[in-house]
């Protein structure tokens, strides 16, 4: 057992049939001695006298909140949760698996550019009593500060008959050089919990690896005289990192129509402008990448052709 | 500006060009490394992340962007001086920062040139033949160098008597790249900024 | 399978005009570019032209324009490359090649030698 | 005009060895650059895609890098089949140009 956070505590099981358990003392938080007695959640029904209360944990109808009083008055709680470990595994049941970029990824991150500010975001099917809290530090063994805000309801969408919910949460490197050379990761903890369980979450990653920048901005077109070719041209994203000369991107340019099976003209460069042939109810199309570190491009910003 | 290829600007283009080249070069080596080697830990991942360079030279501070220099956190340790010779220098103009920052590059290059050449040496005797260093990749460390012209005293090719550990060389070569590789994005960010400045 | 069928070899006259065909199949023949490109007896690729079948653009590499017109007829799922002026230093093997993508070419047909002898 | 140079124009490979053909742009085109093989009597085949993408149905031991003005195709080991006549190709812009042509031969 160990403490989450003030009375809340965590108490880890083998979860297997006929499991033995775990034995739990709870302690009531007072000076009294005498005359108290615990009982569990809403229920009035005492489960034992004394400053201290051992119990069996088996299941989830053994934890909840524990309170201890005193001639009708509330002395202190004891909020106790679950964590749930399955064949040596620690359960994963309160986020989706997102399997990108592989298999059991819950957590995603992504940051715009390299100031240290970045976005992790995850997915639940789940909608009520459901808390989630954030730690994030640069490097493990003597960890440098890393400061998260709370993590909110970000999106919601229907899958079928599901509906999924997306939370995100933004973190910022307390003390980040744009230029430094990463040799320790960023770790993430993401604490969840539904109900009386808990889970713990972990995403461990260089800044460089999650970089995706926005799309570029200012897409405008020119037609060529006495020709089919349009000179496209564009600007850097205002969120990408400065000067742009040292943060350089590189360039996909495309004109497509509605559908991907569509034919189209692809053409990568590094300048902020290009000259593609444009075509009736097509769209010209651009994304971006870091030009020196092959992280993930940008979505498309796009402009019809006519 | 783009430069064309055939009319080199005399300045930092040759540099650009090669650091190019070098980023090239060490992706591919690092990306055979990892097919190669895939039952070895040799991803991002797994492996440390050690760099050779540290406390030896200052890559990153001395050639950090003006715009940068106002980041404190870009600030920890500019102290280290070189050598302020070079090819690569666009005019007499050029600053000391100039100066240090591809001296920096240039003693990178050649600490990594010799653990790289040394490290071949113990591929070489390996009796399974698995993965040498690409001679491209050696090839255009080389040019580079000679690109940024420093004098420097030459670093002695580190042998060792003892029998080769085949596994933990090939580890420390995904430890080497890795860095390198990450040493070669700076490079070649340094050296578009130089171009464009 | 997709595959381009060109029209057979042809011997022509200097001053003279030359038509080659390409028959596609498989896959919609207006969704793909369509390409000509040629090649001189042990010589490199040499790329004339492009048309899109689906609206009739087309491009022509500077060299050849005015003297070359590239034509698709989307009924029959061909494409024509027709080649005025000719003079001995057109002699050449003739590709028809195609691709979703504009710039490079993904199926190649098996070529048309044109040779130009007076 | 964009001006594509290979080296070398001939290239005698011991079959099981590697080769790595060069590719040089006269100005920089990214990587617009793609690569045919064409054996004789024969029209050309698509081997890479934008530098570097693999095509499917192309062996694995057929690889690309390059970016900017400087390219390689590289062949792993090189097998009966693959001597042939290799070109590249820029698409950065009209005109579409090819490289002269490098031929593997049997060393």
């Known amino acids: 057992i160990w403490e989450l956070k003030k009375d809340v505590y965590v108490v880890e099981l083998d979860w297997y049939p006929d499991a033995p358990g775990e034995m739990v003392v709870l302690t009531c938080d007072t000076p009294e001695e005498d005359g108290i007695t615990w009982t569990l959640d809403q229920s009035s029904e005492v489960l034992g006298s004394g400053k201290t209360l051992t119990i069996q944990v088996k299941e989830f109808g053994d934890a909840g909140q524990y309170t201890c009083h005193k001639g009708g008055e509330v002395l202190s709680h004891s909020l106790l949760l679950l964590h749930k470990k399955e064949d040596g595994i620690w359960s994963t049941d309160i986020l989706k698996d997102q399997k990108e970029p592989k298999n059991k990824t819950f957590l995603r991150c992504e940051a715009k550019n390299y100031s240290g500010r970045f976005t992790c975001w995850w997915l639940t099917t789940i909608s009520t009593d459901l808390t989630f809290s954030v730690k994030s530090s640069r490097g493990s063994s003597d960890p440098q500060g890393v400061t998260c805000g709370a993590a909110t309801l970000s999106a919601e969408r229907v899958r079928g008959d599901n509906k999924e919910y997306e939370y995100s949460v933004e973190c910022q490197e307390d003390s980040a050089c744009p230029a430094a050379e990463e040799s320790l990761p960023i770790e993430v903890m993401v604490d969840a919990v539904h109900k009386l369980k808990y889970e713990n979450y972990t995403s461990s990653f260089f800044i460089r690896d999650i970089i995706k920048p926005d799309p570029p901005k200012n897409l405008q077109l020119k037609p060529l005289k006495n020709s089919r070719q349009v000179e496209v041209s564009w600007e850097y994203p205002d969120t990408w990192s400065t000067p742009h000369s040292y943060f350089s991107l590189t360039f996909c340019v495309q004109v497509q129509g509605k559908s991907k099976r569509e034919k189209k003209d692809r053409v990568f460069t590094d300048k902020t402008s290009a000259t593609v042939i444009c075509r009736k109810n097509a769209s010209i199309s651009v994304r971006a990448q870091d030009r020196y570190y092959s992280s993930s491009w940008s979505e498309w910003a796009s402009v019809p052709c006519s | 500006r783009n430069l064309p290829v055939a009319t080199p600007d005399p300045g930092m283009f040759p540099c650009l060009h090669h650091s190019q080249n070098l980023l090239r070069a060490v992706s591919n080596m690092l990306q055979k490394a990892r097919q190669t080697l895939e039952f070895y830990p040799c991803t991002s991942e797994e492996i440390d992340h050690e760099d050779i360079t540290k406390d030896k030279t200052s890559t990153v501070e001395a050639c950090l962007p003006l715009e940068l220099t106002k980041n404190e956190s870009c600030l920890n340790s500019r102290e280290t001086s070189f050598i302020t010779n070079g090819s690569c220098l666009a005019s007499r103009k050029t600053s000391f920062m100039m100066a240090l920052c591809l001296s920096s590059i240039y003693e990178d290059l050649k600490m990594y040139q010799v653990e790289f050449k040394t490290m071949n040496a113990k591929l070489l005797m390996d009796p399974k033949r698995q993965i040498f260093l690409d001679q491209n990749m050696l090839a255009v460390i080389d040019e580079l160098m000679q690109a940024l012209n420093f004098n420097s005293e030459t670093v002695p090719q580190k042998s060792s008597l003892e029998e080769p550990d085949f596994y933990k060389t090939k580890i420390k070569l995904c430890i080497l790249l890795h860095a390198f590789r990450i040493r070669a994005v700076t490079i070649d960010r340094v050296m578009s900024y130089l171009n464009a400045s | 399978q997709v595959q381009l069928v060109q029209s057979g070899a042809e011997v022509k006259k200097p001053g003279s005009s030359v038509k080659v065909s390409c028959k596609a199949s498989?896959?919609?023949?207006?969704?793909?570019?369509l390409h000509w490109v040629r090649q001189a007896p042990g010589q490199g690729l040499e790329w004339m032209g492009w048309i899109d079948p689906e609206n009739g653009d087309t491009e022509y590499a500077p060299k050849f324009q005015g003297r070359v017109t590239i034509t698709a007829d989307e009924s029959t799922s061909t494409a024509y490359m027709e080649l005025s002026s000719l003079r001995s230093e057109d002699t050449a093997v003739y590709y028809c090649a195609r691709n979703k993508e504009l710039r490079y070419f993904d199926v190649i047909g098996q070529g048309t030698l044109v040779t130009v002898s007076s | 005009d964009i001006v594509m140079t290979q080296s070398p124009l001939s290239l005698p490979v011991t079959p099981g060895e590697p080769a790595s053909i060069s590719c040089r742009a006269s100005?920089?085109?990214?990587?617009?650059l793609h690569w045919y093989q064409q054996k004789p009597g024969q029209a050309p085949r698509q081997l890479i895609a934008f530098a570097s993408q693999s095509i499917s149905g192309v062996p694995s031991r057929f690889s690309g890098s390059g970016s900017g003005t400087d390219f390689t195709l590289t062949i792993s080991s090189l097998q009966p089949e693959d001597f042939a006549t290799y070109y590249c190709q820029q698409s950065n812009s009209f005109p579409l140009t090819f490289g002269q042509g490098t031929k593997v031969e049997i060393k």
């Open positions: 100005q920089s085109i990214s990587i617009n």
């Open positions: 498989g896959g919609t023949f207006s969704d793909y570019y």
